[in-house]
Interface confidence: medium
Amino acid sequence: QSYSISQLDIFSQETPLDMAPASFDDQYAGCLADMTAALPDLNHSEFQANKVYADGWAQANNQWQERRAWGSVWGSLPPSPPGFRDEHGVALLAYTANSPLHKEFNAAVREAGRSRAHYLHHFSFKTLHFLLTEALQLLRSHRSRGCQQVYRGVHGLRFRPAGPGATVRLGGFASASLKNVAAQQFGEDTFFGIWTCLGAPIRGYSFFPEEEEVLIPPFETFQVINTSRPTQGPARIYLRALGKRSTYNCEYIKEKKCRSGPCWLGSS
């Protein structure tokens, strides 16, 4: 059963499900090595500017060291793909921890792409964004399966999707689960069924491995297949992977090169 217009009015905070034009969606194509080299200084300055990030990173780092020390005993660390470094593991643990970090991070990601200047001067999660993006690329390339069906429950927000056939993005890094039932516990307001091709399973790097988490990057695009809005229970939205789309690429490195020599603003 569908809502009438008057019933819709009570859901005062419906969020449009669209291409999330203000999302920061850098894929760092062609500048992975440059970004990695820039991380130590960048990370240090971001810790100083962002207590939530510093605290979340410290907690995750402790957990990572513990898992590394005991991993062979507990089997708690999966074999890492080539190129996967400690900081990738820490970033994934920090993101999945039950702390305010993932919440503040994603809120910032959804706004950081308003302009290049906004990203450069007001986004204090550049390191985490890069590490998560690269970690997902590494984990995905290591995986045998291509695309997979996942489920995402959203708590406290109802989405107002465009009609079937519309192209959308999720706006930030989106946590989903391979388990329908796990997602439904979070999805009292909106429940997504998603066929993702760029999401990567992060079970072995999550604070909560039992959730069978898959993390979807902000630049993956989807087609809306179907939506339903029952009067009871969550709105349901079904998405199918289309591809990827980024407005930004290597913005931090471009800015660094502009400061240190002839300005390089071409694509990488």
Epitope: V52, N98, P100, H155, G156, Q185, F186, E211
Partner: antibody
Framework: QVTLKESGPVLVKPTETLTLTCTVS??????????VSWIRQPPGKALEWLAH???????SYSTSLKSRLTISKDTSKSQVVLTMTNMDPVDTATYYC??????????????WGQGTLVTVSS | QIVLTQSPAIMSASLGEKVTMTCSAS?????MHWYQQKSGTSPKRWIY???KLASGVPARFSGSGSGTSYSLTISSMEAGDAATYYC?????????FGAGTKLELK
């Protein structure tokens, strides 16, 4: 549909121990990012947080009542139990259990039971 | 622990009137949450994460603030809004509630 339901005695005598049970449905007590709190409200007064428990058995108690409170859970029965020793007439209140969404430093109580009024009197 | 002070303790408003109540924290908090409670019923999550409205909450409600100062505003009072509103923080343990603002219909 998430529901929480409190049960326990409506009347206890001073110095006795109160045992309250919160039975939940619509979510699992093993869900990693959710927990259950007990909160009370004396008649005509404000809400007071008492204790919480998360899926990993992490517990926390109100500083002023810590010595009198114990919280535990039975995941298989979907129940959270609060015991409060040495009851006093000032403990007369409606006792609520509420689901926590989130965790320390950003959590809130997104679903509440209907509450059970406990009167402490001889 | 962080003490939350709500003001006013009691207020009355006419139908259609704009209503603002405040919640002041003794130390800076990251988020403020608000609950509505009507007589004889349990509290309901009303506004969370400072400004997000819970499902079913009319759009005339809004929340704002940062640091130590937060507020709940009703753009146009309706009869069904008469209730007690509590603010709550969990930026540091333990979670604490304000003493409530009782909103009556004039």
């Amino acid at each position: 549909q998430v529901t929480l339901k409190e049960s326990g005695p409506v009347l206890v005598k001073p110095t006795e121990t109160l045992t309250l049970t919160c039975t939940v449905s619509g979510f699992s007590l093993s869900n990693a990012r959710m927990g259950v709190s007990w909160i009370r409200q004396p008649p005509g007064k404000a809400l007071e947080w008492l204790a919480h428990i998360f899926s990993n058995d992490e517990k926390s108690y109100s500083t002023s009542l810590k010595s009198r409170l114990t919280i535990s859970k039975d995941t298989s029965k979907s129940q959270v139990v609060l015991t409060m020793t040495n009851m006093d007439p000032v403990d007369t209140a409606t006792y609520y259990c509420a689901r926590i969404y989130g965790g320390d430093s950003w959590g809130y109580f997104d679903n509440w039971g209907q509450g059970t009024l406990v009167t402490v009197s001889s | 622990q962080i003490v939350l002070t709500q003001s006013p303790a009691i207020m009355s408003a006419s139908l259609g009137e704009k209503v603002t109540m405040t919640c002041s924290a003794s130390s800076s908090v990251s988020y403020m949450h608000w609950y509505q409670q009507k007589s004889g019923t349990s509290p309901k999550r009303w506004i969370y994460d400072t400004s997000k409205l819970a499902s079913g909450v009319p759009a005339r409600f809004s929340g704002s603030g940062s640091g130590t100062s937060y507020s709940l505003t009703i753009s146009s009072m309706e009869a069904g809004d008469a209730a007690t509103y509590y603010c709550q923080q969990w930026s540091s343990n333990p979670p604490t509630f304000g003493a409530g603002t009782k909103l009556e219909l004039k």
